[in-house]
Amino acid sequence: QAEESPFVGNPGNITGARGLTGTLRCQLQVQGEPPEVHWLRDGQILELADSTQTQVPLGEDEQDDWIVVSQLRITSLQLSDTGQYQCLVFLGHQTFVSQPGYVGLEGLPYFLEEPEDRTVAANTPFNLSCQAQGPPEPVDLLWLQDAVPLATAPGHGPQRSLHVPGLNKTSSFSCEAHNAKGVTTSRTATITVLPQQPRNLHLVSRQPTELEVAWTPGLSGIYPLTHCTLQAVLSDDGMGIQAGEPDPPEEPLTSQASVPPHQLRLGSLHPHTPYHIRVACTSSQGPSSWTHWLPVETPEGVPLGPPENISATRNGSQAFVHWQEPRAPLQGTLLGYRLAYQGQDTPEVLMDIGLRQEVTLELQGDGSVSNLTVCVAAYTAAGDGPWSLPVPLEAWRPGQAQPVHQLVKEPSTPAFSWPHHHHHHHHHH
């Protein structure tokens, strides 16, 4: 049969509120060298126990009896400290444990989760969380909005999660936790009501250097909108603005619009250029979220100036004309050049030269037409740019370089088709 337990004093019980400090104590009487006393909580050796051991000899000889007292200090009682405590000693080849003592927690409810401050769009549903525990259980929750209870009694209304169908003004929320020991009140969360995200951002009109955009404002609760902010950023295929990407990759062009009207003219833009735009509206409580980025594009314009450095020389029934691209902005993709020539008493002849910058003309009437002038204009998909001033055809003088003659051909079909002017085809043999 087992030897008699050396324990003469067993741990007591401790029950208290969180943060309490207490001590468990056990005492044993042993013969010979005193053993180390270990503490168990729910069968598990406490490795980092705050314990002290005191040993008092009862006689002169080491082999006499000793009284050993071990004290375990629990500082700032927590739920994790609760359980059954025992002392444990290894004596020779035997193991002894004391009778158990119990540590319990009992006090006002303790919050595991409290409502947090947040922003919400006006009239938009959201949830708040609150969680509390004892012991003692049960713990019943009571939600308050602007200090007004949302239920008749604790435990009757929503508990861990409060669903708010929407707010039209900034409000405060808190929760009370009730148990047999009393009431604890959570922090107060401020829920700030911001305007809803604007909707239906769209283009009203487009011009090569400006876009007019409009949108529908979202609800903003009791707070009128003070202004809306529009951002535009150049889109680049490699830029990576996705539908909901939060930040543009470069500094956007930002404009503020007084509201109403919910419309804004964005000027000083590049023609024939893709942009992404978004809008947010602000009330006294703060700004709404941005709309998704909307891809838009300024249209092409016509070239702003005529071709440059036009020269025209004549040699008998042939005329050689060449020019350079306009220096003025093209406002789009250059599709080609139109050339017009006219004699003093002859009708004007219009030609589409395509993208070449020189042409050899076969003149009718064996070169007898007098006072011939040539005009050239550049064109984009949006139309013709201004015509150059008429350039007179100069007679070719020996010593001048003979021009390289090229056939006047129909240009390759452009990406956009336009109503063609009457083309004259002159074949040079």
Epitope: Q1, A2, S5, H38, L40, D42, G43, Q44, I45, E47, L48, Q84, Q86, L88, T95, V97, Q99, P100
Partner: antibody, heavy 116, light 106 residues
């Protein structure tokens, strides 16, 4: 001396329950925790849970919670483990073991075979 | 849960040799325990509180270590030491065991 003697081998069908006993002697039964440990064929050791005979308090490994029930009868110094809704992967040797912060004494083991 | 990894999984040794088995924990622990299990027998406590010999265990067995790394040493191996050895922790719940090291005598 401390001894833990377990009940004999069992063969059960899937979905059935099994109850294994562990009789303790040689020490004050109500002072020490009784643990149960599983060892599947050719496998290692897996802790199932403990019971404190003095109070009947129990603690279970999450993996076994809901299917295992630990009980004691202090009048005959015997601990029991009941495993319900048996599956083929419950086939194993089940050991009871006394604990003093570790498993200082073990029963001889009970083989439970689950087979249809 | 804390995972214990033993090394090696298997070792074949000759009598009188010194054997070292290591056990590595996935988190720091305070104490390690070691058990011996012979074929068709139940496990038997060998070392407790990292370095204390359990009742009846020969002095050729010893344990050491701290933190995450622990060692079981058998000085001058004997034929009767052929068994599987398991390390175990109970620093946090649930208590867990290593996968075992099988020791074979040549």
């Amino acid at each position: 001396q401390v001894q833990l003697v377990q009940s004999g081998a069992e063969v059960k069908k899937p979905g059935a329950s099994v109850k294994v006993s562990c009789k303790a002697s040689g020490y004050p039964f109500t002072d020490f925790y009784i643990n149960w440990v599983k060892q599947a064929p050719g496998q290692g050791l897996e802790w199932i849970g403990w019971i404190y005979p003095g109070s009947g308090n129990t603690k279970y490994n999450e993996k076994f919670k809901g299917r295992v029930t630990l009980t004691v009868d202090t009048s005959i110094s015997t601990a029991y483990m009941e495993l319900s809704r048996l599956r083929s992967d419950d086939t194993a040797v089940y050991y009871c073991a006394r604990s003093t912060g570790f498993f200082d004494y073990w029963g001889q083991g009970t083989l439970v075979t689950v087979s249809s | 849960e804390i995972v214990l990894t033993q090394s090696p999984d298997f070792q074949s040794v000759t009598p009188k040799e010194k054997v070292t088995i290591t056990c590595s924990a996935s988190s720091s622990i305070g104490y390690m325990y070691w058990y011996q299990q012979k074929p068709d027998q139940s496990p038997k406590s060998l070392i407790y509180l990292t370095s204390n010999l359990a009742s009846g265990v020969p002095s050729r067995f010893s344990g050491s270590g701290s933190g995450t790394d622990y060692t079981l040493t058998i000085n001058s191996l004997e034929a009767e030491d052929a068994a599987t050895y398991y390390c175990q922790q109970w620093s946090s719940n649930p208590p867990t065991f290593g996968q075992g090291t099988k020791l074979e005598i040549k």
